[in-house]
């Protein structure tokens, strides 16, 4: 059920994820509607604590019944995640919060004319997902015009204080306004030597792409195909970095193939939703349900209609058995990160996600590939 | 593989599951072997740090391909679980722990001649798990011969620190030395309505008995069965306890059954291991692995065979298609706490639990009870 | 407050039988332990039979197994101790005892509340 209303001075109780910092209720359900777990979340306003470091926490939570007990709360503003809403969602936010200071890892600073120019600056530089601009009022007078680039591991600030004479704000690569090169191809035999920030599993190199895309630090990536030769890194997708933010190094090997992150490209393409099938194939994770249905179809639209449910895995019924009418399996699953655990073959199942990270993707993309 | 040396002045690193206290490697070992998914652990000893609140830091850990990287670290001593080997496990510690204190909840003191009598009462108190006592030599005269009973939610200590003139040590209920009542009845058609500290899902009451046993602080338990009218609550085992260590209110309603924890019997049944098979039963979870095997007993080896492995469900082949003699299909499975996410029942698997708790049960109950 | 209230004692052949009663008040026996003690002249108290009284579980001393039988009544707030096949060293005072905790059931130092006991008496 689609809940849009936000519940004033109350707080969920129980049910954390985990606990970010975000400048706003409605970038707390952003982050939580990102997230993949996410379906409810709170977020502690400005004053909702004698304590100023638990101000701006934003407190991701997951519920297996999909609802919590609502505690009073002075200052805690409590919402559910868009994921059970049918509406268009989007990653984009151009609000700018004033006499906030979002902290983070500040990596580069300059002078610049004005707050948009430093947003631009932000959206334009590969490692940047948010920045301080220091206004004309800013008490030091040394530090007035200073633009602050700032990244973070969650790509979320660590901690937001009141400042008096700044504004601060995202990037706006997610809303299809950088400039930075958008490269497409992706390099078959190439195995990358980077940083790996993270690794999750993946059937194929187009998804690896895709949940790179969708991680905050990920720039480019290594995928390790089937038939890798070292079977425990098979569907290994490999997230990396550089302080460039180009590979440094590339070595030629077979069964391998890497590629960048398309965060800052202006998409005609599903970069959020994996909207394909795959044959004779097992993704395993947490089993949420099995339920009886006739056709993978309806099985990843089932998968799509519950809030939980990230990918599932589909065993069609016994046709030699003259049972050709007769619904197969459809085991609905999930996992930590909204990938699989491991992925099997040689099993005859047909496996797929969830679908509804494709309302994040945009209009021209969902009309181009509208499953 | 089993590996029972320990690495001295090694860390394993990453793989945290959860930090306890534990006065000894050897204890650390313990609490290891008897958590749900710890295969490794790595243990702080005394001075093994500048500071002394990190001493004694039992790091349980885990791992998907049962091994962690060594790292050189003074002072640290690490190794794996008894999962992996095949001897005879016990629970009982009967050490004793010169000038440690053991903190916890101190519920009780009483004077006592000494550290065995002191033992004793906590082996005889409901709620006791490790006691300290206040030698002769005890610097604070009026301390002396004091004996502190004492609890914590997850049955270790808080934290240990130095202290001169105490004795710490553990309970010996899990030695068959208690004298306190052994309760077997199980009673139907009753909730005990005294307050819950936590629940699992369970097959059936006889399960849901043994993990109340297993449990730090559980005394009693109502189980809800799959008959029980409210669907969510069903297979719902609810772990209990009270002040008095006896239910306080007894509510007659049918499809509940209710029993007591088995932690001070003297055993002649299996109080850790589940050795049933359940029919057209699916235990859901997070999956580990799919193998192709011939019959429950084999995917009941298959698991137990796994250090990872909890439970499974098993698919026989489709007798129905002249295929008498194919394999069926193993699915290995674990969770968060080693007990099943959900259960469903009508989908045709046949389900059951590792046997390698029954390593645990002591040598009459393993004779009794083989499998 | 909690009063227990013995009786049923008294004199009797060996090989015979008694039935002692304890009536409980100001307390609902229906989750508690309630024990039967006996102290002989010159003796320690020593636990002889205990239940259970949420359920049916009992306990007992191997003393006095096969012979002794405790069991209770819980409308009325009466637990009984059957004695068959008495024995002279049978012979003391049998007090009744109660404590609304889990408890060590034959232990005479866990037991909060106490009657003023009954005397048995077997002779040969």
């Known amino acids: 059920e689609c809940v849009t209303k936000v519940f004033k001075d109350i707080s969920f109780q129980g049910g954390d994820l985990s606990t970010v910092f975000t400048p706003s209720a409605t970038y707390c359900r952003l982050v939580c509607t990102h997230h993949p777990r996410c379906l409810l979340f709170t977020f502690m306003a400005e004053s909702s604590s004698d304590d100023p470091t638990k101000w701006f926490a934003c407190i991701l939570k997951d519920s297996v019944t999909e609802i919590l007990p609502m505690v009073n709360m002075t200052g805690a503003i409590s919402g559910y995640s868009f994921k059970q809403c049918p509406q268009q969602l989007s990653t984009c936010s151009k609000d700018v919060y004033v006499n906030l200071d979002m902290k983070g890892m500040n990596y580069n600073s300059s002078v610049v004319k004005n707050a948009r120019e430093c947003q631009e600056r932000c959206t334009d530089d590969a490692h940047c997902q948010f920045f301080t601009y220091a206004t004309g009022y800013f008490p030091s007078v040394d530090h007035r015009k200073m633009c602050l680039l700032k990244y973070t591991r969650t790509g979320t600030p660590t901690t937001i204080t009141k400042l008096n004479g700044v504004v601060s704000g995202f990037s706006l690569k997610s809303c299809g306004l950088s400039n930075l090169a958008c490269i497409r191809d992706i390099f078959p035999n190439t195995v990358l030597a980077d940083l790996n920030i993270d690794s999750v599993v993946a059937p194929d190199a187009f998804v690896c792409r895709r949940i790179c895309t969708h991680h905050p630090t990920c720039l480019f990536f290594t995928f390790f195909s089937q038939a890798w030769p070292k079977e425990s890194q098979r569907h290994l997708c490999l997230l990396k970095t550089s302080e460039s933010g180009l590979p440094s190094t590339r070595i030629t090997k077979s069964h391998a193939l890497s590629g960048f992150s398309l965060q800052h490209c202006r998409h005609s393409v599903p970069v959020f939703c994996h909207p394909s099938f795959y044959n004779d194939t097992d993704f395993l994770g947490e089993e949420l349900d099995i339920v009886d249905v006739k056709g993978q179809e309806t099985c990843q639209k089932t998968c799509t209609n519950n809030a939980r449910c990230q990918f599932f895995t589909y065993y069609p019924s016994h046709r030699l058995c003259n049972e050709r009418n007769r619904r197969g399996r459809c085991y609905l699953k999930l996992s930590s990160n909204g990938s699989p655990t491991r992925i099997l073959h040689g099993r005859g199942g047909i496996s797929g996600y969830s679908l509804r990270l494709c309302k994040m993707d945009n209009v021209c993309t969902t009309k181009i590939n509208p499953r | 593989e089993c590996v029972t040396k320990v690495f001295k002045d090694i860390s394993f690193q990453g793989g945290d599951l959860s930090t306890v206290f534990t006065p000894s490697a050897t204890y650390c070992r313990l609490v290891c072997t008897h958590h749900p998914r710890c295969l490794l652990f790595t243990f702080m000893a005394e001075s093994s740090s500048d500071d002394p609140t990190k001493w004694f830091a039992c790091i349980l850990k885990d791992s998907v391909t049962e091994i962690l990287p060594m790292v050189n670290m003074t002072g640290a001593i690490s190794g794996y679980s008894f999962k992996q080997c095949p001897q005879q496990l016990s629970t009982c510690s009967k050490d004793v722990y010169v000038n440690l204190d053991m903190k916890g909840m101190n519920y009780n003191s009483s004077v006592v001649k000494n550290a065995r009598e002191c033992q004793e009462r906590c082996t005889d108190d409901a709620h006791c798990q490790f006691f300290t006592y206040a030698t002769g030599y005890f610097p604070s005269v009026d301390h002396r011969k004091m004996c502190l009973l004492k609890y914590t939610r997850t049955g270790t200590p808080t934290t240990i620190t130095k202290l001169n003139g105490v004795v710490s040590g553990f309970s010996l209920k899990s030695c068959g030395l208690s004298n306190l009542a052994c309760i077997r009845d199980i009673f139907p058609n009753t909730v005990l309505a005294d307050l819950n500290i936590d629940s699992v899902v369970a097959p059936d009451a006889f399960v849901c008995r043994r993990i109340c046993t297993h449990h730090p602080t559980c005394l009693f338990f109502t189980f809800f069965s799959q008959a029980w009218p409210k669907e969510s609550q069903r297979h719902l085992c609810l772990l209990k306890t009270s002040e008095s260590g006896l239910p306080s209110t007894r509510i007659t309603k049918s499809h509940a059954l209710s029993g007591f924890s088995l932690q001070h019997c003297r055993h002649s049944v299996p109080v850790f291991c589940h050795p049933s098979f359940y029919n057209d039963t699916d235990f859901l979870g997070e999956e580990l692995d799919i193998v192709d095997v011939k019959g429950q007993e084999t995917c009941q080896k298959t698991c137990t065979n796994n250090a990872r492995c909890q439970f499974f469900t098993y698919y026989p082949s489709h007798r129905l298609c002249n295929e008498r003699n194919r394999r069926g299909r193993c699915y290995l499975k674990l969770s968060s706490n080693g007990s099943p996410t959900r259960i469903l029942h009508g989908r045709g698997g046949i389900s059951g639990y590792s046997l390698r708790l029954c390593k645990m049960d002591n040598v009459c109950t393993t004779k009794i009870n083989p499998r | 407050q909690v009063q227990l209230q013995e009786s049923g004692g008294g004199s009797v052949q060996a090989g015979g039988s008694l039935r002692l009663s304890c009536a409980a008040s100001g307390f609902t026996a229906s989750s508690n332990f309630m024990g039967w003690f006996r102290q002989a002249p010159g003796k320690e108290r020593e636990g002889v039979a205990a239940?259970?009284?949420?359920?049916?579980?009992?306990f007992y001393a191997d003393s006095v197994k096969g012979r002794f039988t405790i069991s209770q009544d819980n409308a009325k707030n009466t637990v009984y101790l059957e004695m068959d096949t008495l024995k002279p060293e049978d012979t003391a005072m049998y007090y009744c005892?109660?404590?609304?905790?889990?408890?060590?059931?034959?232990?005479?130092?866990?037991?909060?509340?106490w009657g003023q006991g009954t005397q048995v008496t077997v002779s040969s």
């Open positions: 239940i259970y009284t949420g359920g049916a579980s009992t």
């Open positions: 005892a109660a404590a609304p905790r889990w408890i060590a059931p034959l232990r005479a130092d866990r037991y909060e509340y």
